[in-house]
Structure formats: C-alpha cells, structure tokens
C-alpha cells in the first residue's frame, strides 16, 4: 500500500501518532465509531507526556478518550493494559455515581476541565479526540 | 472534477447475487471513508453501509448485515458492494457516496438500479 | 436508532415563496444534521451540514437552523429549480438514518 509518511490534512503529529480535536460533541460509542471510520482510535493516553500534549490542544473542556469500562474492568480501546499502564484520574474517581438519574453508573472515561479525568454517563455528548499510529497509518489491509 | 460512477446493476432472482463497483476520481479516494445508500422506487433514502478510507472499519444497516459486504480496493479507487441472499425489498437504486468529516455525504454518484424479481 | 420525522410530507408553492420544512429527530442529536435535495431520477444533492452550515456552492436563499431534536430548511424566495424532494439526515450515530422526504411543488 501507499506509505504515508505524515498525518492526514487537519491532524496534528506528535510523537509518531496524528491526532484528530473535534469541536462539537457526541455520545463516547458514537465517537468511537467516529474515529473508526477515520482508520483511528479514541485517544489513549500512555504517559504523562502525552496527557499534557492532548490536554493543551483540547482546553478546559470536558472530552472522552478511548478508555471504558462498559464490560467490567477498565479497558483501552487498543488493547493497552490499564493496571500497568498510565493513570490520571481526579481524586475520588472513578466512583461509577448513579446518582445522576439518567439510569446506571458511569461508565466511560473523559478528560474534565482541569485535565485529570473522571467517568461519565457515555450518553453525553462530549468532544472526542481521535488519534492513529503513523506506522500503523503507513500499511493498507489486505483485499478480502 | 470529483465523481462517482456505480455499475453493476440489474435484474437478479430472490436468493441470487449482485456485485456492485463505484468509480472514484478528482479526490484522494484513500482518505475518505465511503457509503452506500439506496433509495427503492417511489421511496426515501436508506443508508446501507460505510466502509473507512484504508478498508479497515465497516459498519451496516441491520437490514443487509450478513448479507451485504462493503469493500475497497484504493489502488483501482474503486468501492465495491457484494449482496447476496438478495430479497424483493432490496429492490432500489443504489448511490454510492463520500463521507465528510461531519458524517454527511458531499458527492454522489448517479445511482445504479437493482431490481430483485422471480 | 434514531428515527427521522419531515413535516410537511408536501408543500405547494409559487415562485418567490418562503418555504421551510421541519425535520424531528427521535432522540438529541444536538446539531448533527444535513439537508438534501433531490430530483426525479438524479442523486441528492447536500444542501446543509451540521445543521446550520451551508455547502459550498448552495445559493444562499437556503439556510438551516435548529439544534437538539427540532430543526428547519427555510428556502427564503423559491426559485423554478428549487422544485424538489428534500431529506434530512442524521449524522449523530451510525447507522446513519435520513428522513422520509418533504415534496416542494408548483401550486
């Protein structure tokens, strides 16, 4: 396949990976799919370096990255390990309140105003960032 | 100029198969993900299904998934849609359409007519 | 999924004519929404995307606006070929779904 070399137009480089902002909201699966269709992921944040590199581009304001535990346990959505891996979350998070009354807990991941992040209703619809590896970016699949 | 181009269309009996293509050219056909929609005779839009720009993600309506398959072959800038197990009501024109990034179809092709009939 | 309503199913119309047609989505999509317009036998064409913005190339009489669950394509002067089908369509959530269609014709 062609090798791409760079991020597509509209996508900011950093550190190997392209990363996507959106400026208007949707439900986390909704977003999910969003990044899907652009041969992407939700954003997953493996190290100090990286929070402070997505928290600058997205401001105080509140958006999911790629990490949910819909199924029981934390879990990225690239398969990352959640108990070894890099964590930031605001003091008392996650707690899963159901105290929302939209029904359930909270079950999905975003950054909140300040960075640090917390679990949420994954109804909300709440700016997203999408985020590929270049390497990976460079290889086409294979013709079913 | 961008187009798109759909051939492959025609009669074909209840439980039959159909292949159809879409011919992409004036844009970088790899960086856009791409749909089908239909549209049966005197009827509203129905969206079928969407494939990412490196083929790697699909998604269907639930009335073709496990019949229909979406696929793409960028070298050729051309969009397939296999459809087998055909039935009466996947009787339409078939649109093949880009994505945008608002999740909104900015070029059409003219359609391509499958009629499904014994 | 998310269900798609237009009302009306047709309008009537002369030429200079303000039209505007309402597109009501089963659940919030906040402004995730565009307008087409199609022809008998041609492909649609988009009109508006994200609710409110307007396609390159779209004449500016034809403007959108709503957000939520409610939204509208106002045609501010109806013009000989803006005698169509219109549909609205929901890009919130996959699948995608599209409105059953407003016809615009000549009173």
């Known amino acids: 396949g062609s090798e791409r070399t760079c991020c597509p137009v509209n996508w900011v480089e950093h550190e190997r990976s392209c990363y996507w902002f959106s400026r208007s909201g949707k439900a986390w699966a909704d977003a999910d799919n969003y990044c899907r269709l652009e041969d992407a992921h939700l954003v997953v944040v493996t190290s100090w370096e990286e929070q402070k590199f997505v928290q600058h581009h997205i401001g105080p304001v509140n958006t999911w990255m790629g990490l949910h535990d819909q199924n029981g346990p934390w879990k990225w959505v690239d398969g990352t390990d959640y108990e070894t891996g890099f964590k930031n979350w605001r003091p008392e998070q996650p707690d899963d309140w159901y105290g929302h009354g939209l029904g359930g807990g909270e079950d999905c991941a975003h950054f909140t105003d300040d960075g640090r992040w917390n679990d949420d209703v994954c109804q909300r619809p709440y700016r997203w960032v999408c985020e590929t590896e270049l390497d990976k970016a460079s290889q086409e699949p294979p013709l079913l | 100029e961008v187009q798109l181009l759909e051939s492959g269309g025609g009669l074909e009996q209840p439980g039959g198969s159909l292949r159809l293509s879409c011919a992409a050219s004036?844009?970088?056909?790899?960086?856009?993900?791409m749909n089908w929609v239909r549209q049966a005779p005197g009827k509203g839009l129905e969206w079928v299904s969407v494939?990412?720009?490196?083929?790697?993600?699909?998604f269907y309506a639930d009335s073709v998934k496990g019949r229909f398959t979406i696929s793409r072959d960028n070298s050729k800038n051309t969009l397939f849609l296999q459809m087998n197990s055909l039935r009466a009501e996947d009787t339409a024109v078939y649109f093949c359409?880009?994505?945008?990034?608002?999740?909104?179809?900015?070029?059409w092709g003219q359609g391509t007519m499958v009629t499904v009939s014994s | 999924d998310i269900q798609m309503t237009q009302s009306p199913s047709s309008v009537s119309a002369s030429v200079g004519d303000r039209v505007t047609i309402t597109c009501r989505a089963s659940q919030d999509i906040t402004s995730w929404l565009a307008w087409y317009q199609q022809k008998p036998g041609k492909a649609p064409k988009l009109l508006i995307y994200?609710?409110?913005s307007l396609q390159s190339g779209v004449p500016s009489r034809f403007s959108g606006s709503g957000s939520g669950t409610d939204f509208i394509l106002t045609i501010s002067s109806l013009q000989p070929e803006d005698f169509a089908f219109y549909h609205c369509?929901?890009?919130?959530?996959?699948?995608?779904?599209f409105g059953p269609g407003t016809k615009v014709d000549i009173n």
């Open positions: 359409a880009k994505r945008t990034g608002d999740d909104v179809f900015d070029v």
């Open positions: 004036g844009f970088t056909f790899s960086s856009f993900a």
């Open positions: 494939i990412s720009g490196r083929g790697g993600n699909t």
């Open positions: 369509q929901q890009a919130n959530s996959i699948p995608f779904t």
């Open positions: 994200a609710a409110s």
